[in-house]
Structures are given as C-alpha cells and as structure tokens.
C-alpha cells in the first residue's frame, strides 16, 4: 500500500477582504489515522488555524464532514478574511502517538493573498490661508489595501497634475499598504471654486477609482481692492464718498472710515454681491458734512481682511472748493453691488 | 496518562438500575472521538453495547438490544462517560467496558478502562 | 443489524508458525475493520485499524487485509506472546446511512498446538 501524501493542489488562492478563503486539502490514504491539523507558516513559530482534535476556531469550517465514512477530504473555509490573513498554509497530517501525535506528511503549501480596497482618499490642505500666485501643499492618504500596487494621480478642476511626491509605506512585505503623496498648487485668483482631486486606482476597485477632494474656498484668500470715490452732492454742504471693496475672499472684512486720521465709523461686511468667480464685492457709503471741516478732509477707508493687516485707500476732499464730484481715478468697473446709505 | 477508570459496578436484582462511570483522563473529550461501552459475559466473546459523540453533537448510538433500556450519555466538564441500565436480566451480567473510539470511531478502539463487573443475580 | 462471522472459533498452533484469521462482513464495510488481541482477565487491545493499518506500538508480524465484505488477520510468525482470543470489529460508522455498526465478531483463540 502506497504511504499517505497530503496534496494541496492550488499553490496560491486570492480572495477579497471580507470574503471566504477556500484552502484545498486531500489525504491519499486513510491510513495512519491522525488528525489534520492547517498552519499559517512553517517551523517553530508556525500558527496553529485548525486542529480536527480538539479546539475551538469559530473561523474556520470543513467543506466536508469529517466524520463521514471513508473522507479524506480536509479542506478548510476561513471566513470574513483580513488582510492580516495573507500567507503560506499548510495542511499537516499527525499520525497517533502516544502521548501526543507526530506530524507525519504536509502539504506543499498554499499561498493565501488578500485583496484589501484601500480607504477612501483624505486630502488636506494647508493649515493657513494663502494668497493667488503663492503656491500650497496638499496632502493626500489612504490605507489598508493589498497587494502593493496602486496608482494616485492627482487634479485640479479635471486637468491633471505633475508636481507631487507620493510614497506607499512600508516598503518590504506587508499584509497591507498606506500611500502618502504630496502636491503643489499655484493659486490664482479665479480658485475660490477650484477643486484638488486625489484619486486613487487600484486593482481592487475594478476600475473604478476612489477619490478624495479639496475645496480651494478653503484655502484661498483673495486680498480685496479698494476704490473710493465722490458721489453727486446730496445737499448743500453734503458729499457722498463710497468705497468699494471689490474681488474679496472668503467673506470676512471689517471697515473703518477715517476723517483726517480720526475713526469716524466702522462696519463688518454683511450683505455682500458674490461674483462668478465666487470672489465677493461690497461698497460702503459715507456722508461727510463739509460745513463742519473749515480744512480740507482726507477721507479712509480702511479694510481688514480675514485678519489679515489693514489695507486703505484715500480720498481728499476739498473744503475751499465749491462741492462737486472728486475721486480718485481707479477706473471702477460696474459691479452691480448693494448699494447701501450709511449715515 | 491517558487512561479510563470505570466504576458503579456491583449486584443487582432483575428488573433494577445501575449506572456505571467511566472517568477520562490525559486527553479532553471531543468530536474527534466516540467514546463507547462493550461488554463481556463471562466465558464469552465481545459485544457493542453503545458509542456517544463526545464533541458538541452528542450524537448517541446503540446496539439493537440495548435501545429503550440502556442510554449512554457524557459530561464534558468532568471528562466523565456515563452508560444508565434499566430493567436489568440476568443475561446482563458481564464486565462492562468504556473504550474511546478513535477518529470517530474509525480508528479502532485504541483506549480501554480495566472493566467493571455487572452481576444481575435476585 | 451487520453480522461479523470470524473463522476459525480457535486454531492450535506453534511458535513461528503463520497464522490466518478470517473475518466476514454480512454487508459492504469498505475498508472500516478492526483487529483486536485479548488475553485473559484484561482489556482487549487494539492491533490493526483500517483494514490495514497497524497500530503505534504493534509488532510488525501482525497484518490485516482486505476490503468489502472479507478480511484477514495474519500473524507471520507466532511468538510465545500472542497466545490469546483475537477479535474482528465493524467501524462502520452512521454518518452515510444512519446505520451505525460496531459488531464484534465471535473470536478466535489461538492456542499453543
């Protein structure tokens, strides 16, 4: 009689993480008799995933019943399969002994690889705002996929980008992978609707990249520009002057108005007109009673932005004159903004 | 070491109950083995009374003769084979052994206890 | 109920001498017999499984073979020791069929001649 040989016949299995890893295993004789006992690894530090004898391995089932007459089938199911599975199993056959069994034959092993879909890409930006023509780092992860090999490209508003560095951790053999890839973007002054793509292939997803994006609105600032100007007269010893803050991004300004360096009234910025660009225009209006200056008047206006240090622009008004319509000479162009009366 | 002790042996009229133990040691009852009873009557060849899956199932077989009278039965948690006599004859009368059936049984009956005599004798 | 006929009931014989036990099935049993040794006022003890298979600690002189419904017992050359009553078991096992079987056969008594 031919001595016992353990085959398993599929030298390596892949399955998805998640799913039912199908370990094949035959006996060719059924004697000696002997549990079958499956390990992940060989020699001293091998781990023990099945043992026919005694145990409990809530994870692990025969595809046959083993106490059917005449089998020699011991195939195993391991389910809910993780990446933290992947390795060589083997198949061993003790034969009885007294008092503990003696391994007798083994398999040849089979190789069991997890597929493992990486985690939806997480792209940060940088911790500050940053202004058009500045350029700005952003960061994009994912983790846990298996095998290795995967693809991150990265884009702005759907055109690809070139500068980036990206790195898949850890080098050697792992049961999974992170990938960590940096890019620069230069900003520009239309990005408070620009999107930064980081998009992530792998063999996993069937085509079907996962992606991960940035909005620029939160990482823009768009610095405003300032214009004041002198309206008609309103009234005998009255002049309007507006200020019009226009191109601004994100929303948040503070208005001072200065007569002759003096605070004369300041303002948060509320109803705002929103350009195409997304960029916001504002305008403030002032009321200067000329017959209580017996000078001539520097009119401020003053902006603070996001924080950011005052920027202001400044209008002089002629008292001597007989009032009429000064300003400076920025070309304005018709921005359609809310007008409000501010006294 | 890897033994089995039987014990509740001893006389009983006709028509009386016995139960007899079998305790297991040096190896855990589980599915991979059976555990049974044989008898012997004095002078006389070997005769399967009954075998009991000794892992989760419990699953529990019997000789044709035995159903109805004898159940076999076992405690996990003290390793321990139980075999419940009812209405005894004095054809009953014999040692009665526990043997682990090996690889469910398959494997031949590799463990035997030292037997216990069961007299059934008014 | 499966029936095991064993033959002879006893045979004398001398030491060296080989020795044949036959055991039949009244059904097919593949290959799921066993082959026991008991001497008196002891346990039996088992020798060969499967048919064929001998058991860790049996002398190589004890053989079995066969398959289905006829098997045999051979022991190639007796020793002094194994005078004794040898019996063949069924261990068919129910998990196919629900027909359990675990019937010994009669004996044989292998006598000194």
């Known amino acids: 009689e031919e001595e016992l040989q353990v085959i398993q016949p599929d030298k390596s299995v892949l399955v998805a993480a998640g799913e039912t890893a199908t370990l094949r295993c035959t006996a060719t004789s059924l004697i000696p008799v002997g549990p079958i006992q499956w390990f992940r690894g060989a020699g001293p530090g091998r781990e023990l995933i099945y043992n026919q004898k005694e145990g409990h391995f809530p994870r692990v089932t025969t595809v046959s019943d083993l106490t059917k007459r005449n089998n020699m089938d011991f195939s195993i199911r391991i389910g809910n399969i993780t990446p933290a599975d992947a390795g060589t199993y083997y198949c061993v056959k003790f034969r009885k002994g007294s008092p503990d069994d003696v391994e007798f034959k083994s398999g040849a092993g089979t190789e069991l690889s997890v597929r493992a879909k990486p985690s939806a890409p997480v792209v940060s930006g940088p911790a500050a705002r940053a202004t058009p023509q500045h350029t700005v780092s952003f960061t994009c992860e994912s983790h846990g996929f298996s095998p290795r090999d995967i693809t991150l490209k990265w884009f702005k508003n759907g055109n690809e980008l070139s500068d980036f560095q990206t790195n898949v951790d850890p080098v050697g053999e792992s049961v999974s992978y992170s990938i960590h890839s940096t890019a620069k973007v230069v900003l520009t002054r239309e990005d408070v609707h620009s999107q930064v793509i980081c998009e992530v292939a792998h063999v996993t997803l069937q085509g079907d990249p996962l992606r991960g994006t940035a909005n620029l609105s939160e990482t823009i600032r768009v610095p405003p520009t300032l214009e004041v100007t002198q309206q008609p007269v309103r009234a005998e010893n009255q002049v309007n002057v507006t200020c019009q803050v226009r191109k601004f991004y994100p929303q948040r300004l503070q208005l001072t108005w200065l007569e002759n360096g003096n605070v004369s009234r300041t303002e948060t910025a509320s109803t705002v007109t929103e350009n195409k660009d997304g960029t916001y225009n504002w305008m403030s209006w002032l009321l200067v009673n000329v017959s209580a200056h017996r000078d001539d008047v520097k009119l401020t206006c003053q902006v603070e932005h996001d924080g950011q240090p005052a920027v202001s622009k400044s209008h002089d008004l002629k008292v001597s004159a007989h009032p009429k319509e000064q300003g400076s000479n920025t070309a304005a162009e018709n921005t359609g903004s809310n007008e409000r009366n501010i006294y | 070491e890897v033994q089995l002790v039987e014990s509740g042996g001893g006389l009983v009229q006709p028509g009386g109950s016995l139960r007899l133990s079998c305790a297991a040691s040096?190896?855990?009852?589980?599915?991979?083995?059976?555990m049974c009873w044989v008898r012997q009557a004095p002078g006389k060849g070997l005769e399967w009374v009954a075998c009991?899956?000794?892992?989760?199932?419990?699953?529990?077989h019997y000789a044709s003769w035995a159903k109805g009278r004898f159940t076999i039965s076992r405690d996990n948690s003290k390793n321990t084979l139980y075999l419940q006599m009812n209405s005894l004859r004095a054809e009953d009368t014999a040692v009665y052994y526990c043997?682990?059936?090996?690889?469910?049984?398959?494997?031949?009956?590799?463990?035997w206890g030292q037997g216990t005599l069961v007299t059934v004798s008014s | 109920d499966i029936q095991m006929t064993q033959s002879p009931s006893s045979l004398s014989a001398s030491v060296g001498d080989r020795v044949t036990i036959t055991c039949q099935a009244s059904?097919?049993?593949?290959?799921?017999l066993a082959w026991y040794q008991q001497k008196p006022g002891k346990a039996p003890k088992l020798l060969i499984y499967?048919?064929?298979g001998l058991e860790s600690g049996v002398p190589s002189r004890f053989s079995g073979s066969g398959s289905g419904t006829d098997f045999t017992l051979t022991i190639s050359s007796l020793q002094p020791e194994d005078f004794a009553t040898y019996y063949c078991?069924?261990?068919?096992?129910?998990?196919?069929?629900?027909?359990?079987?675990?019937?010994f056969g009669g004996g044989t008594k292998v006598e000194i001649k």
């Open positions: 043997a682990r059936a090996y690889e469910y049984g398959y494997g031949g009956y590799d463990l």
């Open positions: 040096g190896f855990s009852f589980s599915s991979y083995y059976f």
């Open positions: 009991i899956d000794a892992g989760y199932s419990g699953g529990s």
């Open positions: 059904q097919s049993i593949d290959s799921n």
């Open positions: 499967r048919a064929s």
């Open positions: 078991q069924c261990t068919y096992g129910s998990n196919d069929s629900g027909n359990y079987a675990n019937a």
